[in-house]
């Protein structure tokens, strides 16, 4: 039910990448405002984004407290200028979000190749270990810190002049691959969480090629 001049939020959607997590919803408010609450299954509700006219709320600070918990959010609708007003049942109109478990559902952000170094016929490719907003002991954890061996990277590499392409995989952030001497190669990486069935892979990193600034070549 609710008051006649407010409508319930709908299409509540979690948007999350590398644990940066925002709840979005509709509709754009007309003469109403929203407040969001979030809780774990067993926890108390905590209010965020008080009386906002936005249709999104950044809940990162709450979910990073324990990324393996399952969270539920709800969006309350209030008449603009009369936020004390409640519905006919004695409480404001609200809508529940789907459940959200950050560890299982956050999207993997596009990775970046930090560097590559050639020594003879070997190339060491290093993937940047991106910092997340997850904290432990007052320090921000990297993606590898959070996921550990649950996260792998797939490297694709190919000769600049060729239609062939090879792959290697690692559960660290480094690859050591064999290359042909005197050939220039290009590289791209993708993050994967093999244990997942959805949101399993990132987009491919930007392509980096030998002969560009990120690389280093040493003749042995």
């Amino acid at each position: 039910s609710g008051t006649t001049n407010t409508v319930a939020a709908y299409n509540l959607t979690w948007k999350s990448t590398n644990f940066k997590t925002i709840l979005e919803w509709e509709p754009k408010p007309v003469n109403q405002v929203y407040t969001v609450q979030i809780s774990t299954k067993s926890g108390d509700w905590k209010s965020k984004c008080f009386y906002t006219t936005d249709t999104e709320c950044d809940l990162t600070d709450e979910i990073v407290k324990d990324v393996k918990q399952t969270y539920l959010a709800r969006v309350f609708s209030y008449p603009a200028g009369n936020v004390e007003s409640t519905g006919s049942a004695g409480e404001p109109l609200y809508e529940n979000s789907p459940e959200f478990t950050p560890y299982l559902e956050t999207n993997l952000g596009q990775p970046t190749i930090q560097s590559f170094e050639q020594v003879g016929t070997k190339v060491n490719v290093t993937v940047e270990d991106e910092r997340t907003l997850v904290r432990r002991n007052n320090t921000f954890l990297s993606l590898r810190d959070v996921f550990g061996k649950d996260l792998i990277y797939t490297l694709y590499y190919w000769k600049s002049s060729s239609s062939g392409k090879k792959t290697a995989k690692t559960n660290t952030n480094e690859f050591l691959i064999d290359v042909d001497k005197g050939e220039n190669y290009c590289f791209s990486v993708q993050a994967v969480i093999p244990s997942r069935t959805v949101n399993r892979k990132s987009t491919d990193s930007p392509v980096e090629c030998m002969g560009q600034e990120k690389g280093e070549f040493r003749e042995i």
């Epitope: 792998i152 792959t167 690692t170």
Partner: antibody
Framework: QVQLKESGPALVKPTQTLTLTCTVS????????VHWIRQPPGKALEWLGV???????DYSTSLKTRLTISRDTSKNQVVLTMTNMDPVDTATYYC??????????WGQGTLVTVSS | DIQMTQSPSSLSASVGDRVTITCRAS??????LAWYQQKPGKAPKLLIH???SLQSGVPSRFSGSGSGTDFTLTISSLQPEDFATYYC????????FGQGTKVEIK
Amino acid sequence: QVQLKESGPALVKPTQTLTLTCTVSGFSLTNYNVHWIRQPPGKALEWLGVIWTDGKTDYSTSLKTRLTISRDTSKNQVVLTMTNMDPVDTATYYCARDWDTGFDYWGQGTLVTVSS
Amino acid sequence: DIQMTQSPSSLSASVGDRVTITCRASQNINNILAWYQQKPGKAPKLLIHYTSSLQSGVPSRFSGSGSGTDFTLTISSLQPEDFATYYCQQAYTPYAFGQGTKVEIK
């Protein structure tokens, strides 16, 4: 649902070229890599090659001079071409979808016999 | 190229037995190892990927372990439908399978 189906000749003569087609449904060839694998009667699986999502390819070291993998994304088809066929190439040929850390869907396989 | 060596090539076991199959890679494969089950006249079926991740729908009696170069597939209590050939596979190009382990009825 996800499906792969191999088609092509059941019998080829020695020195001829084999062309097999893998027709896929339920997924896009621009989102998943597709591999070819073969298995001679009573023997182990042997990886032949792959076509990546961008159309680039990679092949078995021992067979790369004889293999070509191509695709037609509009028809959802991947094509394996193998030249200079020999009786030792008699096998069941499979295509399979790559799931990054394993092949999660396979075709039913097609038996190719090489004989004069 | 990375080669895969499976052992044993065959084994005989009874329903209810615990069965262990091993696979060794010629170099470190960073746990990128899959196990397949194949029955006569059928395509292989993915059981386990990334060393120990059970593929959806696969019974929990199947488990995988290992790291570096040495890996194991374990069937905790063999069932009648488990008599088949099992293959390991690594996913660095060029990809490679083990030579297979046939699990037969004792």
